[in-house]
Interface confidence: low
């Protein structure tokens, strides 16, 4: 329904607290370099204006679209061109082009320092003095580093942050309480960020139809007792919500997400038997709980999928009369029977089925031609199953750090032109798949592994797109989203690469490494490992093991030495010489 004032409508629906949080996220995602104080000033102005519109929807400017209101606010920022360069050119455009222009200037890898968590005591003091400001800083810092973070979900994480601080800041050992809990929130939020970026990539590159197919498969796995009409309705709503968030319409997105949660809870009987526990929660937690809901039990009496999609003599006619509906029902039927498959795999199977019908329905004897289609799915299913098996075995053998290093070597050999920080980030994230998925029951491993890897590889693609350096990466990234992971898996050592010159300074270390936290130490070592592979792309596993073992011993020895600086200065050149020799 149309509202006189869109901003008043959203303010009333969302309430002041969530409204302010979402406006702050929106501004932080658009203008990623602005300090918190600048954004919070704008947020307050927008909130005050929204309140005047709630009081009188006919007040001046209240009928303007939210994009117009937000864009006008952003474009009024002093020194916009000084800080943002060509982004200021967007302000010369009219809506909707202006908003499109802002979206195109979102930076997936902003030049911002890593978000440093303050000391526990300082954190608690700051939180207790002003919880609103503290959580506002959290929203701002996360949103500017992740400009596609799913806004209503970020509000949920801020709420979790608030809960943890409220609980731990009264404890005697605040750090012991805070660290593991905040680490868990951070880990979940980082995974959520790459997953949402993948959804926005899917929407941007392949449109709503591709995203809706993803949603149909996912919903069908989760709600196998729901009918196709119900799944279609849910998938359509989820597609709309994600389109809004990816497009910067954060207020509408959050409002529609709350509406969808309400609808699901009012229609549990036709959706799933597992929803009740979620439906008793407040709005943010309810939506999050529904998004993470376990799969409902598969109906016991599902007939073979072949009856409708292979054996029925009318397959080609059904397909011809309504291609999307017919393929949608295929995807629905296949997905509800296979919660043990990844969504990417299910979409590949649907694509294979579509290609088979396109070919066979044009031939003389279609049933004979498409009769073997289900058997032809076998190699497509086996490939990711083998991937999971071999990678989980390797993870179990090496542990997370060792597995990350194996992945780093593999990916540096595949795409040695990619910058070392990007390779290290990708390998560390890809390597976490072991901890995240390999410990799960067999039936959950494949969907966990492949859908997580797809999201991480999407991040690699997004970063590579900014500065393309590897033809192989470009090729894998420009193809279909569901083929990306198999494409990367199939890459071998890049034979066209000219090895990097050996530079001693790349492998020169100082005593500052000794005081670094473990994670930073690992990154330093992994950076050296990637550089080694770039120098010797065909180095054997044993050669690399020798050099890295030597390196670890060197760091360990010098960090224990009385005169650390002297140790690094004298032992360092020896290490470099030994490494060159070992790799010769």
């Amino acid at each position: 329904e149309a509202h006189k004032s869109e901003i008043a409508h959203r303010f009333k629906d969302l309430g002041e607290q969530h409204f302010k949080g979402l406006v702050l996220i929106a501004f932080s995602q658009y203008l990623q370099k602005c300090p918190y104080e600048e954004h919070i000033k704008l947020v307050q102005e927008v909130t005050d204006f929204a309140k005047t519109c709630v009081a009188d929807e006919n007040a001046e400017n209240c009928d303007k679209s939210i994009h117009t209101l937000f864009g006008d606010k952003l474009c009024a920022i002093p020194k916009l061109r000084d800080n943002y360069g060509e982004l200021a050119d967007c302000c010369a455009k009219q809506e909707p082009e202006r908003n499109e222009c802002f979206l195109q200037h979102k930076d997936d890898n902003p030049n911002l320092p890593p978000f440093q968590r303050p000391e526990a005591e300082a954190m608690c003091t700051s939180f207790q003095e002003n919880p609103t400001s503290f959580l506002g800083h959290y929203l701002h810092e996360v949103a500017r580093r992740h400009p596609y973070f799913y806004a209503p979900e970020l509000l949920y994480y801020a709420e979790k942050y608030n809960e943890v601080l409220t609980q731990c800041c009264t404890e005697s050992d605040k750090a012991a309480c805070l660290t593991p809990k905040l680490d868990a929130v951070k880990e979940k939020a980082l995974v959520a960020a790459v997953r949402q970026r993948m959804k926005c990539s899917s929407m941007q590159r392949f449109g709503e139809r591709a995203f809706k197919a993803w949603a149909v498969a996912r919903m069908s796995q989760r709600f196998p007792n729901a009918e196709f009409a119900e799944i279609t309705k849910l998938a359509t709503d989820v597609t709309k919500i994600n389109k809004e968030c990816c497009h910067g319409d954060l207020l509408e997105c959050a409002d529609d997400r709350a509406e969808l949660a309400k609808y699901m809870c009012e229609n549990q009987a036709t959706i799933s038997s597992k929803l009740q526990a979620c439906c008793d929660k407040p709005v943010l937690q309810k939506s999050q709980c529904l998004a993470e809901i376990e799969h409902d039990n598969i109906p016991a009496d599902l007939p073979s999928i072949a009856a409708d999609f292979v054996e029925d003599k009318e397959v080609c006619k059904n397909y011809a009369e309504a291609k999307d509906v017919f393929l949608g029902t295929f995807l629905y039927e296949y997905s509800r029977r296979h919660p043990d498959y990844s969504v990417s795999l299910l979409l590949r199977l649907a694509k294979k089925y579509e290609a088979t019908l396109e070919k066979c329905c044009a031939e003389g004897d279609p049933p004979a031609c498409y009769g073997t289609v289900l058997a032809e799915f076998q190699p497509l299913v086996e490939e990711p199953k083998n991937l999971v098996k071999t990678n989980c075995e390797l993870y179990e053998k090496l542990g997370e750090y060792g597995f990350q290093n194996a992945v780093l070597v593999r990916y540096t050999q595949k795409a040695p032109q990619v910058s070392t920080p990007t390779l290290v980030e990708a390998a560390r994230n890809l390597g976490r798949v072991g901890t995240k998925c390999c410990t799960l029951p067999e039936a959950q491993r494949l969907p966990c592994v492949e859908d997580y890897l797809s999201a991480i590889l999407n991040r690699l693609c997004v970063l590579h797109e900014k500065t393309p350096v590897s033809e192989k990466v470009t090729k894998c990234c420009s193809g279909s989203l569901v083929e990306r992971r198999p494409c990367f898996s199939a890459l071998t050592v890049d034979e066209t690469y000219v090895p990097k010159e050996f530079k001693a300074e790349t492998f020169t270390f100082h005593s500052d490494i000794c005081t670094l936290p473990d994670k930073e130490k690992q990154i330093k070592k992994q950076t050296a490992l990637a550089e080694l592979v770039k120098h010797k792309p065909k180095a054997t596993e044993d050669q690399l093991k020798t050099v890295m073992g030597d390196f670890a011993q060197f760091v360990d020895k010098c960090c224990k030495a009385a005169d650390k600086d002297n140790c690094f200065a004298t032992e360092g050149p020896n290490l470099v010489a030994r490494s060159k020799e070992a790799l010769a």
């Epitope: 007792n225 009918e227 196709f228 009409a229 119900e230 279609t232 309705k233 109906p299 007939p303 009856a307 409708d308 029925d312 003599k313 009318e314 059904n318 009369e321 309504a322 509906v325 017919f326 029902t329 295929f330 629905y332 039927e333």
Partner: nanobody, 126 residues
Framework: EVQLLESGGGLVQPGGSLRLSCAAS????????VAWFRQAPGKEREFVAG????????YYADSVKGRFTISRDNSKNTLYLQMNSLRPEDTAVYYC???????????????????WGQGTLVTVSS
């Protein structure tokens, strides 16, 4: 559970018209694939027309195309079959069938429909 109840059958002259109704209960008719089948004495049950669930895509047997029209009234939860230009070979018992929880497309295979009405007799004769 879906209950289906057909009505509207009867005796009609060749070239005449009839409108069959199928009232559904226990399930919204727009959420399920529904179809009309017929069975003439001594013959197999055959598909006549169908309509998809959640999508208004209609399917017809070649023998009735252009003469019969399938439709549904969601507010009344009722399926209809408008039969024009009736021929003696259209004489049969007409059944309404539903397949919820299956692909929301109609199939011409009777075995795939779990729910059936009791049928209504249509006789075309002068």
């Amino acid at each position: 559970e879906v209950q289906l109840l057909e009505s509207g059958g009867g005796l009609v002259q060749p070239g005449g018209s009839l409108r069959l109704s199928c009232a559904a209960s226990g399930r919204y008719i727009d959420e399920t694939a529904v179809a009309w089948f017929r069975q003439a004495p001594g013959k197999e049950r055959e598909f006549v027309a169908g309509i998809g669930g959640g999508v208004d895509i209609t399917y017809y047997a070649d023998s009735v195309k252009g003469r019969f029209t399938i439709s549904r009234d969601n507010s009344k939860n009722t399926l209809y079959l408008q039969m024009n230009s009736l021929r003696p070979e259209d004489t049969a018992v007409y059944y309404c069938a539903a397949r919820p929880g299956r692909p929301q497309i109609t199939s011409k295979v009777a075995d795939l429909y779990p729910y059936w009405g009791q049928g209504t007799l249509v006789t075309v004769s002068s």
